[in-house]
Interface confidence: low
């Protein structure tokens, strides 16, 4: 009997080049008679071309939707109604081959060929891509707001914003052949709901999506995206109605950058350079392939790759890597964007060197990848520290904080967060080391106090990279480093001459001269601390809501004591830059730190002075009494305080606090308070300083008010951002 074939719709999208026609501006306007007339002719030609091949029996419909340069490029889609079993056989490559074959067969033919009546189609300029009915629907929804732009070499073209009467717009971008397009998106509003999708082809083909961005991203205020070639499409979908365009788009053609390097590393440890995808920090392009060959000077060394917010993971079952594929010594790894630092350590077993390949396996790409490379000693990868196998990083060992996710850096410690005497492995508290009084049996705590020592968890690193044994030597009035760098940048941490916080007391003017009040429209929102002439530090979560993300909203007050009145010592500033820690995660409160750059430098006075910043190795001993200050609520759920409150709190061991908060306390957090509660920070204190007084009389910033369960509740300590855990980022920004 006769069996009906099951027919399915197969959609193709593509472009062809016409050699005997030239592009004109009229063809960018869909309403123009030139566009209508050219479209009719091109549609006819396309249909005749398809039906001239064996695809003709499957032809269903077609449409030429746009034109471009080159001399004239026609962009089209068509649908074939094909038997289901032929679906795989009629791939875009096969369809392209059939059409090219047809074009070539008539190039020198004198016979009349319908599709050659008006157009001389270049067989080499034909491109056919796989599409879907959904793609065509998406394309059609943008045609009421369709913009074609050709951008020449050396040009940067700023694109006209969307038509706000439309719900969707498409920018069809084209550049010179053999170049690649680089699109720059800059969000200009603090909040919006607009969506932009960038494609590696002329229309919105889902399979050729490079990336999509949504809603005035604060994490990425500027996004640069590379296409694999000279054609790109950008689709805008309307969010909330806005009188302002929430973004600026500009595009420029750029040359292909080779991504192949041969390097020989020097005979030294630490970072020796940077490898990155082309045009970093632009998103890498859909057809990126990098090959880096690194030669190591000796088998004593291994190769370390240090990544920022990106890690390498083994991928199961040969699934494609969605965030970049890496092959290192024939091992296949997949990239993964994370909110942590990461290092890949590659043992070297042969002098031939190491080849590292990076490939974008799919059209979907992501932020450019940059990696610092260098050597490490294979026999001692982390001198004085612990190698965390989970993330490849060197972390402090036995300092009372589990820096490694598996906690192995705090296992098998003879002395945890204390000094181990050489003689008998007795443990003594760190402030007793190099204090002039021998506490170990044979005085080993007072040895080597005037000379350089190997760097370790509690040693202080001088500017010349040498280390000193004395803990917390900064700004104590005695130079301990050979280069005197421990006594530099010491104009900080001194209280002014001075005669909310739950369970606190009112502060006097000049008592906490680094205290800042961060306000929006005259309302105190968060605390902060002055750390340099133009920088105030606070908590990142103060800016969590989109409506709080704009620098324009904020005013910073310094020298303030009373919220409802001003006194001559207080000064105010606008904010010129707001930087959240790149690893800040709202849900976990990790890396809860932000820096505000003031619009002009502070003039120091008795009421306005910066607090001292601790070195990464600074040890704030659990049990130490420190102080928190702020205008936060005086009771849980209460209104903010009019007067600046101060309260002393005790630093809590990390493992104890971690237990209370069910292991949600990360190495970037520090706990303070009391088992009985009562004295604590509260709403409105967020971002304010937790400061501890050194023996020198100077105050050092230990933490920032971050989170906690309620305010002053028994058994629940306050959780603070640990400054020593984020100090390298702070220094990198401020200097």
């Amino acid at each position: 009997g006769y069996k009906a074939e099951v027919m399915v719709s197969q959609v193709y999208s593509g472009s062809l080049r016409v050699l005997n026609r030239h592009f004109s501006q009229d063809l960018t306007r869909r309403e123009s008679s030139a566009f209508r007339s050219e479209t009719a002719k091109a549609q006819k030609m396309l249909k005749e071309l398809i039906t001239s091949t064996r695809l003709g029996t499957y032809y269903n419909s077609s449409s030429v939707y746009s034109f471009g340069e080159g001399p004239l490029t026609c962009f089209f889609w068509f649908i074939l109604q094909i038997p289901e079993h032929r679906r795989l056989m009629l791939s875009p490559e096969v369809v392209q081959a059939l059409l090219v074959e047809e074009l070539l067969s008539t190039v020198n033919s004198s016979a009349a060929v319908p599709y050659r009546a008006e157009y001389e189609v270049d067989p080499e300029g034909l491109v056919i891509l796989e599409a879907s009915v959904k793609d065509i629907a998406a394309l059609n929804s943008t045609l009421g707001c369709y913009r074609y732009s050709y951008v020449g070499q050396g040009q940067v073209l700023r694109l006209k914003g969307p038509d706000h009467l439309a719900s969707s717009c498409l920018w069809h971008l084209q550049g010179p052949k053999d170049l690649m397009l680089k699109l720059r998106l800059e969000w200009t509003l603090a909040e919006c709901r607009d969506r932009l999708a960038m494609y590696d082809v002329a229309g919105p083909l889902e399979k050729r999506l490079i990336t999509s961005v949504y809603g005035c991203s604060r994490q990425e205020p500027v996004v640069e995206v590379l296409a694999s070639g000279a054609i790109m499409a950008v689709v805008w979908k309307k969010g909330l109605h806005s009188y302002y365009d929430p973004f600026v788009l500009s595009v420029q053609p750029v040359v292909f950058q080779a991504c192949e390097v041969n390097l020989t590393l020097d005979n030294r440890l630490d970072s020796q350079g940077v490898l990155s995808t082309p045009y970093f920090p632009s998103y890498y392009s859909p057809q990126t392939h990098c090959s880096w060959h690194l030669t190591v000077p000796s088998l004593d060394y291994g190769l370390a790759l240090w990544f920022d917010a990106y890690a390498l993971r083994r991928q199961k079952y040969d699934l494609p890597c969605t965030q970049g594929q890496w092959t290192i010594q024939n091992r296949r790894l997949c990239g993964l964007r994370i909110l942590q630092p990461y290092a890949e350590r590659i043992p070297v077993v042969a002098t031939a060197g190491i080849t590292i390949n990076f490939t974008s396996q799919i059209s979907l790409t992501g932020p450019g990848v940059r990696v610092h490379y260098g050597l490490y000693n294979q026999s001692d990868p982390c001198p004085g520290e612990f190698l965390c196998s989970v993330n490849g990083l060197c972390v402090p060992a036995c300092d009372g904080v589990k820096d490694c996710p598996n906690g192995l850096d705090e296992r098998n410690c003879v002395c945890r967060a204390t000094f181990q005497c050489k003689e008998d492995s007795t443990c003594i508290s760190l402030p007793k080391v190099c204090d002039g009084q021998p506490d170990c049996l044979n005085g080993s705590d007072e040895e080597q106090c005037q000379e350089g020592v190997p760097c370790g968890t509690f040693t202080f690193q001088c500017e010349d990279r040498s280390c000193v044994k004395k803990p917390n030597p900064q700004c104590d009035g005695r130079p301990d480093c050979r280069d005197g760098s421990d006594e530099e940048h010491c104009d900080c941490g001194l209280q002014g001459p001075s005669s909310r916080i739950v369970g606190g007391a009112v502060s006097s003017e000049g008592e906490w001269p680094w205290q800042a009040s961060l306000q929006v429209r005259g309302r105190h929102i968060c605390g902060g601390a002055l750390i340099a002439d133009r920088w105030v530090i606070t908590a990142a979560h103060c800016f969590q809501e989109d409506s709080m993300a704009s620098t324009v909203l904020w005013t910073v007050f310094l020298g303030k004591v009373w919220q409802n009145s001003r006194w001559p010592g207080e000064v105010s500033f606008k904010v010129s830059r707001l930087l959240l820690h790149p690893y800040h995660e709202e849900d976990s409160h990790d890396y809860d730190v932000a820096l505000l750059q003031l619009d002009h430098p502070v003039v120091r006075s008795a009421a306005v002075r910066p607090v001292c910043l601790p070195a990464r190795s600074h040890f704030f001993e659990p049990g130490l009494h420190c102080w928190i200050t702020g205008w936060g609520a005086l009771r849980e759920g209460g209104p903010i305080s009019n007067a600046l409150q101060k309260v002393d709190v005790q630093l809590i061991p990390q493992d104890l606090c971690s237990e209370v908060y069910r292991y949600q306390v990360t190495p970037r957090m520090l706990c303070a308070g009391y088992r009985k509660g009562k004295k604590d920070a509260c709403q409105g204190d967020s971002g304010g300083p937790l400061v501890c007084k050194a023996l020198s009389g100077r105050w050092f910033l230990a933490g920032l008010v971050s989170w906690g369960l309620g305010c002053g509740r028994p058994n629940y300590f306050g959780v603070y951002t640990r400054i020593t855990g984020v100090i390298s980022w702070i220094q990198q920004v401020v200097t």
């Epitope: 960018t28 913009r147 732009s149 006209k160 302002y244 973004f247 600026v248 324009v552």
Partner: antibody, heavy 122, light 108 residues
Framework: QLQLQESGPGLVKPSETLSLTCTVS??????????WGWIRQPPGKGLEWIGS???????YYNPSLKSRVVISVDTSRNQFSLKVRSVTAADTAVFYC??????????????WGQGTLVTVSS | SYALTQPPSVSVSPGQTARITCSAD??????GYWYQQKPGQAPVLVIY???ERPSGIPERFSGSSSGTTVTLTISGVQAEDEADYYC???????????FGGGTKLTVL
């Protein structure tokens, strides 16, 4: 009510430097929303944009005048200034300062000073 | 250098409609703006973003955009509308401000 007021000498000798100041009242020049610009109009002719600046000190200039022009800001006085070096008679014009809305795709002047005539003559 | 082209003059009788055009290659990618300038006075913005009217500008002023041309339309022209009209935009990169040469509108 925003007001802009240009001030400076009405007569400048050829080859000297023309200096003008614009005093802004009714809005802070340090507002993050606006740029501030200078435009000139030779007698009987059209408008020509000279350049614009942001309160932070960022500037950009008309390419044809770039080599001779400097725009600077004094946020404490809520003023911005224009200097044009090596003037000739062709620089004789009414000079306007204006608030420049240069936000997103927008790029226009929504408030202007009343203008001041500067004549270049020996 | 990049230029915006305007007709030098347009004449119209009171109550009629006046149309002033401004053309340039970058206008499909950049917005157009219109200013009115009366003798001895500073320019006043009458249309922004091709077709939007600032508050305080009469409804008879409107703007439109088509391809490489923006148009200022004054319907029901009044004697007080006699003035010079300047269009303004930016070059194709969006970097530099450019003014048209101006059009003198005469109300007959």
């Amino acid at each position: 009510q925003l007001q802009l007021q240009e001030s400076g000498p009405g007569l400048v000798k050829p080859s000297e430097t023309l200096s003008l100041t614009c005093t802004v009242s009714g809005d802070s020049i340090s507002s993050h929303t606006y740029w501030w610009g200078w435009i000139r109009q030779p007698p009987g002719k059209g408008l020509e944009w000279i350049g614009s600046m942001f309160y932070s000190g960022s500037t950009y200039y008309n390419p044809s005048l770039k080599s001779r022009v400097v725009i600077s800001v004094d946020t404490s006085r809520n003023q911005f200034s224009l200097k044009v070096r090596s003037v000739t008679a062709a620089d004789t014009a009414v000079f306007y300062c204006a608030r420049h809305n240069n936000w997103g795709m927008e790029n226009y002047f929504d408030d202007w000073g009343q203008g001041t005539l500067v004549t270049v003559s020996s | 250098s990049y230029a915006l082209t305007q007709p030098p003059s347009v004449s119209v009788s009171p109550g009629q409609t006046a149309r002033i055009t401004c053309s340039a290659d970058a206008l499909p990618d950049q917005y157009g703006y219109w200013y009115q300038q009366k003798p001895g006075q500073a320019p006043v913005l009458v249309i922004y973003k091709d077709s939007e009217r600032p508050s305080g500008i009469p409804e008879r002023f409107s703007g439109s955009s088509s391809g490489t041309t923006v148009t200022l339309t004054i319907s029901g022209v009044q004697a007080e509308d006699e003035a010079d009209y300047y269009c303004q935009s930016a070059d194709s990169s969006g970097s530099y401000v450019v003014f048209g040469g101006g059009t003198k509108l005469t109300v007959l």
